[in-house]
Interface confidence: low
């Protein structure tokens, strides 16, 4: 009968040939009377057999990731008679893995958007690397993820590649971050290969800033001949948020005379001071009112950023008009 052990050949061998093992008949007494032959895919090009001894050699560098096993057939012939000594037999050569593939991130480019001020532990995105090496061969394809850039704002779960927030971020200070993640095989042991990917993390705005008046005092004038409804000037607050989070409403906080009103121009986000009642220079030639400004949309959970509305003082001088 045939005698052999299991055949393995390491991939990426740099030698010109590599001895894999021996195929022989137990009838072979070593006097070179038998001839061994190799048949099948790879016979003669990738593998050869010593026709006298049955020793098998790989004569080509192999790549397990391209092909992990070869199924071949062996024959042994009595040279004297030309007849088969054993029935033709099929056998397998397995290509064993070495750690020759670095982890690769297949879903690049990564981009994520998270609301600013998100709490610690908030999931941002999951990055996943793939390693072409054999997962059943030691740790060649066992990956660990780590953060090369992005501390202290982000963290990555070592075994899953899930990126989470580790420190609150303020969009008004920085609105995007580049996080660099490394995936290392061999669970980080010596001989490990690595791959990196970049993740662009953008912060979306939340309403964490209240509007604040640009000036603490505004000076306006109004003619005593001005009719009610006249716009006598504008006031303006600024808000570091953007979009609807920066939309604001102006209002009167204090006007004992009840002479003025403020309306909001939602296009320009300015407050327009309006004359509500006619004024008379001879009766009163100046007024002092206080205005306040608040955001239009404030979710309940963000009210803590909007506890005291910003206020400003407006001094209004009445201009005298000659009366007949």
């Amino acid at each position: 009968g045939w005698v052999w052990n299991q055949f393995f050949v390491p991939e990426e061998m740099n030698t010109t040939s590599h001895h894999i093992g021996q195929l022989r008949s137990d009838l072979d007494n070593g006097n070179n009377s038998f001839q061994y032959k190799l048949l099948g895919a790879g016979a003669g090009s990738t593998f050869i057999i010593d026709e006298r001894t049955g020793d098998i050699y790989a004569i080509q560098k192999l790549d397990r990731e391209e092909r992990s096993l070869y199924i071949l057939r062996a024959q042994v012939i009595d040279i004297a008679t030309g007849r088969a000594v054993e029935p033709e037999s099929e056998f397998v050569i397995k290509v064993s893995d070495i750690n020759d593939n670095e982890p690769k991130f297949l879903d690049e480019p990564y981009e994520a958007i998270v609301p600013e001020m998100s709490p610690e532990g908030t999931l941002v995105i999951q990055v996943t690397a793939s390693d072409a090496d054999d997962p059943s061969s030691g740790n060649n394809a066992r990956l660990l993820y780590s953060l090369l850039q992005g501390q202290p704002y982000f963290s990555v779960e070592p075994t899953t590649g899930v990126i989470r927030i580790s420190s609150k971020m303020d969009r008004e200070l920085q609105d995007e971050y580049w996080v660099i993640i490394q995936a290392k095989d061999m669970i980080g042991q010596p001989g490990a290969l690595s791959g990196t990917t970049s993740v662009l993390i953008k912060l979306s705005d939340v309403n964490d800033n209240k509007p604040i008046f640009k000036e603490s005092l505004y000076r306006l004038t109004v003619s005593e001949s001005a009719p009610t409804g006249t716009s006598i000037g504008t006031i303006m607050a600024y808000d570091n948020d953007i979009g609807e989070n920066a939309e604001m409403d102006y209002s009167i906080e204090e006007d004992d005379s009840q002479t003025f009103d403020i309306i909001t121009n939602h296009e320009t986000q300015e407050g327009i001071v309006i004359l509500k009642k006619k004024v008379d220079f001879e009766h009163q030639n100046h007024y002092g009112i206080r205005a306040k400004v608040k955001n239009h949309h404030v979710p309940e959970q963000l009210m803590k950023y909007h506890t005291e509305a910003s206020t400003t003082f407006i001094k209004i001088q009445v201009e005298d008009v000659d009366e007949p």
């Epitope: 297949l106 879903d107 690049e108 981009e111 994520a112 958007i113 998270v114 609301p115 998100s118 709490p119 532990g121 908030t122 999931l123 941002v124 995105i125 999951q126 996943t128 793939s130 993390i201 953008k202 979306s204 979710p299 959970q301």
Partner: antibody, heavy 121, light 107 residues
Framework: QVQLLESGGGLVQPGGSLRLSCAAS????????MNWVRQAPGKGLEWVST????????YYADSVKGRFTISRDNSKSTLYLQMNSLRAEDTAVYHC??????????????WGQGTTVTVSS | EIVMTQSPVTLSLSLGERATLSCRAS??????LAWFQQKPGQAPRLLIY???TRATGIPARFSGSGSGTEFTLTISSLEPEDFAVYYC?????????FGGGTKVEIK
């Protein structure tokens, strides 16, 4: 605008197979995760499976693991669900749903109208 | 598996009333919660994600709040088109899970 159109549903016997398709348009298909979610008659929503944008990651509900396979052809902007060994309890309307961005990458921001799968002898 | 529990199962309210829907997660899911609206014979529609961020085109009367395990969807003043079934869904952990739904019906 974003559109998702499911097809491939129908009546099948227990143990049979079906392949659902979801044709997507109006967005860069390969940039988004995609999901299958089902709804049995008169019941709530049940997540079935998710695949990442490049197809590297696939996730399945325990109830379908080993029987269903999610896949995608980014060149055709099409999502698939191969359903084998179908059971009566797989009877439902199957919706495909597009993933979102960022913290909502594995979310579901646009849904298709669904295709009906009936498993009955 | 994260279990999502919605309450109440049914909410009977009149037009213009405020609706408050609750959703509880069996363990913390941070702010990774979405709310969907579904009307009979239609596909679900995303209302809220990230616990309180309104999806594109969703009216301001819909607002979400909460984090960790307790979440709320509020409809400030019910319009005729708001009577539907509402589902919460967590996307913090695999498997993704939905709540059983809350039906908002006209009283």
């Amino acid at each position: 605008q974003v559109q998702l159109l499911e097809s491939g549903g129908g009546l099948v016997q227990p143990g049979g197979s079906l392949r659902l398709s979801c044709a997507a348009s109006g967005f860069t298909f390969s940039s988004y995760a995609m999901n299958w979610v089902r709804q049995a008659p008169g019941k709530g929503l049940e997540w079935v499976s998710t695949i990442s944008g490049g197809g590297a990651n696939t996730y399945y509900a325990d109830s379908v693991k080993g029987r269903f396979t999610i896949s995608r052809d980014n060149s055709k902007s099409t999502l698939y669900l191969q359903m084998n060994s179908l059971r009566a309890e797989d009877t439902a309307v199957y919706h495909c749903a597009k993933g979102g961005m960022g913290g909502y990458y594995y979310g579901m921001d646009v849904w298709g109208q669904g295709t009906t799968v009936t498993v009955s002898s | 598996e994260i279990v999502m529990t919605q309450s109440p199962v049914t909410l009977s309210l009149s037009l213009g009333e405020r609706a408050t829907l609750s959703c509880r997660a069996s363990q913390s899911i941070s702010s990774n919660l979405a709310w969907f609206q579904q009307k009979p014979g239609q596909a679900p529609r995303l209302l809220i994600y990230g616990a309180f961020t309104r999806a594109t085109g969703i009216p301001a009367r819909f607002s979400g709040s909460g984090s960790g395990t307790e979440f709320t969807l509020t409809i400030s003043s019910l319009e005729p088109e708001d009577f539907a079934v509402y589902y919460c869904q967590q996307y913090n952990y695999w498997p993704l899970t939905f709540g059983g739904g809350t039906k908002v019906e006209i009283k």
